[in-house]
């Protein structure tokens, strides 16, 4: 099975205990580690931060102790904007420009493959960004030579079912894919304005259309219907949680929300905890499970956070493992307990390393 | 600036062995395959063996298949091509090349060369 | 493994352009990048174009890469010839296991 981990960049800014560079990572617990994000300037595969260059470095030499690990450099993300990565796939000259930077980029930082992070093409960009894919590993099949192995090509896919319809075409972009992320969590938000987790394994009793799709099990049988082959797809599990604010003394699923969770230490987002802030934040806590959907939920105060434990992930590890997927992914391990300070468990990565165990075990 | 300096090459007896070395420095060595390419006097190029960026894979030309093995050590930043039962039809000139990340030799050794005569 | 045939040699005057060609005796030409190589006499190779049709920085724009499918061939052309450009051109190809050079064309400048 595959373990796609991801990490990133922005995380070296965290505070103290919070940052976290590519040499704190365990270069045996991953099969793939996926540097996010690079940028595109000037129709050209670019660094984002100051010292990516640095860090690049960094992250691949982990391979020289393990030759088996591979590494992606992620392309794109929520900050670089789907507008700009629309008009590069839109016009033929930028997509070429584009396609040919990529190849010596990687080669020369010593990655092993790009993926595509394109959050999200809009309707009119479903047929550009197939169009992307397919021009893209034409190209990683003429450059790879003798002592060059194929560049690998993957992308990280929404898991929700409005955004699959409008911005891919399933079985025509898996073609052309290594694999796919499907990116299964953040399916509830504080737009709903109730309290729910955000990385369900199965549908909620309660749930109505739309949230009937707001689930993994959904998302990943919805993906397969679609073309897209089990063996290619790699499910995505969070190493973080979302949080809410309750607006009444009401504290279980569904629950109203003033709004997003108060911001977290180290992480400083509203609304995200880290894995190794829920487990600061689990301390004087009340634990919860949500039986039908898999995982588990605390509050403490005023504070609600669905997230996912070593339990959550073993479950769905033995999901992925039941429906034949070719394995899991991980966003992020510098979210997850990468010192192995915070749980108490004196072990580093400790959801990561629950999902290696769980791929592992026959 | 990538410099490849290759070492190693002389005169010697048909079925002799030699080791020919290229030591490689500007640039991160471990990220690029290398490559060992030849040419007989007054004749063409010939591409003789290539070795992966972790040394993982190699692959030889049919004519040198099963004498000659190409090696790396990527913490001397140095690439190795072993030539056993050495011909008279291995005399050539040998380049040490750098598997570019654009052209796909895009540094090349200043060449070493070996004859092969009894 | 395949082949690349190339012209043993051509020649013209400073000034005029010269073609060369490299055709490959089996597979498709378009299935694998083309370069090609500058050697001038007692020198090291150095690359005039890669992948095709693309110029190392420092490559005069007189040089110039084409392929062409239906003579399953592909091209280097010498504009404005130059006295500096006398040489011998080799183009190379591979496959997932080889790398192959062309035979080699002595470009000779006249006068």
């Known amino acids: 099975y595959k373990l796609v981990c991801y990490y990133t960049s922005w995380s070296q800014y965290r505070e103290g205990d919070g940052s976290c560079f590519p040499d704190a990572l365990d270069r045996f617990l991953c099969t793939h580690i996926i540097y996010s994000f690079a940028n595109i300037s000037n129709d050209h595969i670019d660094t984002w931060e100051w010292n990516d260059v640095t860090l690049y470095g960094m992250l691949n030499t982990l391979k020289n102790r393990n030759p088996n690990l591979k590494t992606l450099l992620s392309v794109g993300g929520w900050n670089f904007g789907s507008q700009r990565f629309s008009k590069i796939a839109s016009n033929t000259q930028s997509r070429r420009t584009f396609i040919k930077s990529v190849p010596p980029f990687l080669r020369t930082h010593g990655f092993d493959g790009l993926d595509l992070a394109w959050l999200y093409p809009g309707r009119r960009d479903k047929q550009h960004f197939t169009t992307l894919i397919k021009e893209m590993k034409a190209e990683f099949i003429k450059e790879a030579q003798p002592g060059k192995k194929q560049l690998l090509l993957s992308a990280a896919l929404s898991a929700g079912k409005v955004t699959i319809d409008s911005s891919y075409d399933i079985a025509k972009i898996s073609q052309h894919l290594d694999f796919i992320s499907i990116m299964t969590y953040d399916f509830h938000g504080a737009w709903r304005g109730t309290t729910g987790h955000h990385s369900p394994l199965f549908r909620g009793q309660e749930d109505a259309s739309p949230d009937r799709f707001s689930n993994t099990d959904y998302a990943v049988g919805y993906m397969l219907r679609l073309g897209a082959p089990a063996s290619k797809l790699v499910m995505g599990i969070p190493t973080f949680g979302r949080s809410f604010t309750l607006a009444s003394s009401e504290t279980g699923v569904g629950a109203p929300i003033s709004g997003p969770g108060i911001p977290g230490r180290f992480t400083k987002e509203a609304g995200t905890l880290a894995y190794y802030e829920i487990c600061d934040f689990l301390r004087g806590a009340t634990v919860h499970r949500i039986l039908g959907q898999q995982v588990p939920y605390a509050t403490k105060g005023n504070q609600w956070v669905g997230y996912d434990d070593q339990e959550s992930v073993k479950s769905k590890v033995q999901y992925l493992k039941d429906r034949q997927l070719a394995g899991a992914m991980v966003w992020a391990l510098d979210l997850d307990d990468f010192q192995g300070s915070f749980c108490g468990q004196d072990l580093r990565f400790p959801l990561t390393n629950a999902i290696k165990d769980a791929l592992a075990a026959t | 600036e990538v410099q490849l300096l290759e070492s190693g090459g002389g005169l010697l007896q048909p079925g002799g062995s030699l080791r020919l070395s290229c030591a490689a420095s500007?640039?991160?060595?471990?990220?690029?395959?290398m490559t060992w390419v030849r040419q007989a006097p007054g004749k063409g190029l010939e591409w003789v063996s290539t070795?992966?960026?972790?040394?993982?894979?190699?692959f030889y030309a049919d004519s040198v298949k099963g004498h000659f093995t190409i090696s790396r050590d990527n913490s001397k930043d140095t690439v190795y091509l072993q030539m056993n039962s050495l011909r008279a039809e291995d005399t050539a000139v040998y380049y040490c090349?750098?598997?570019?990340?654009?052209?796909?030799?895009?540094?090349w050794g200043q060449g070493s060369p070996v004859t092969v005569s009894s | 493994n395949f082949m690349l045939t190339q012209p043993h040699s051509v020649s013209e005057s400073p000034g005029k352009t010269v073609t060369i060609s490299c055709t490959r005796s089996?597979?498709?030409?378009?299935?694998?990048?083309v370069q090609w190589y500058q050697q001038r006499p007692g020198s090291s190779p150095t690359t005039v174009i890669y992948?095709?049709?693309?110029?190392p920085s420092g490559v005069p724009d007189r040089f110039s890469g084409s392929i062409d499918s239906s003579s399953n061939s592909a091209s280097l052309t010498i504009s404005g010839l130059k006295t500096e450009d006398e040489a011998d051109y080799y183009c190379?190809?591979?496959?997932?296991?080889?790398?192959?050079f062309g035979t080699g064309t002595k470009v000779t400048v006249l006068g």
């Open positions: 090349a750098k598997g570019g990340h654009y052209s796909f030799f895009d540094s």
């Open positions: 500007g640039l991160t060595f471990r990220n690029y395959a």
């Open positions: 070795i992966s960026g972790n040394g993982d894979e190699t």
């Open positions: 089996s597979g498709s030409i378009a299935s694998n990048y």
């Open positions: 992948e095709d049709n693309q110029r």
């Open positions: 190379q190809s591979y496959d997932s296991s080889n790398y192959v």
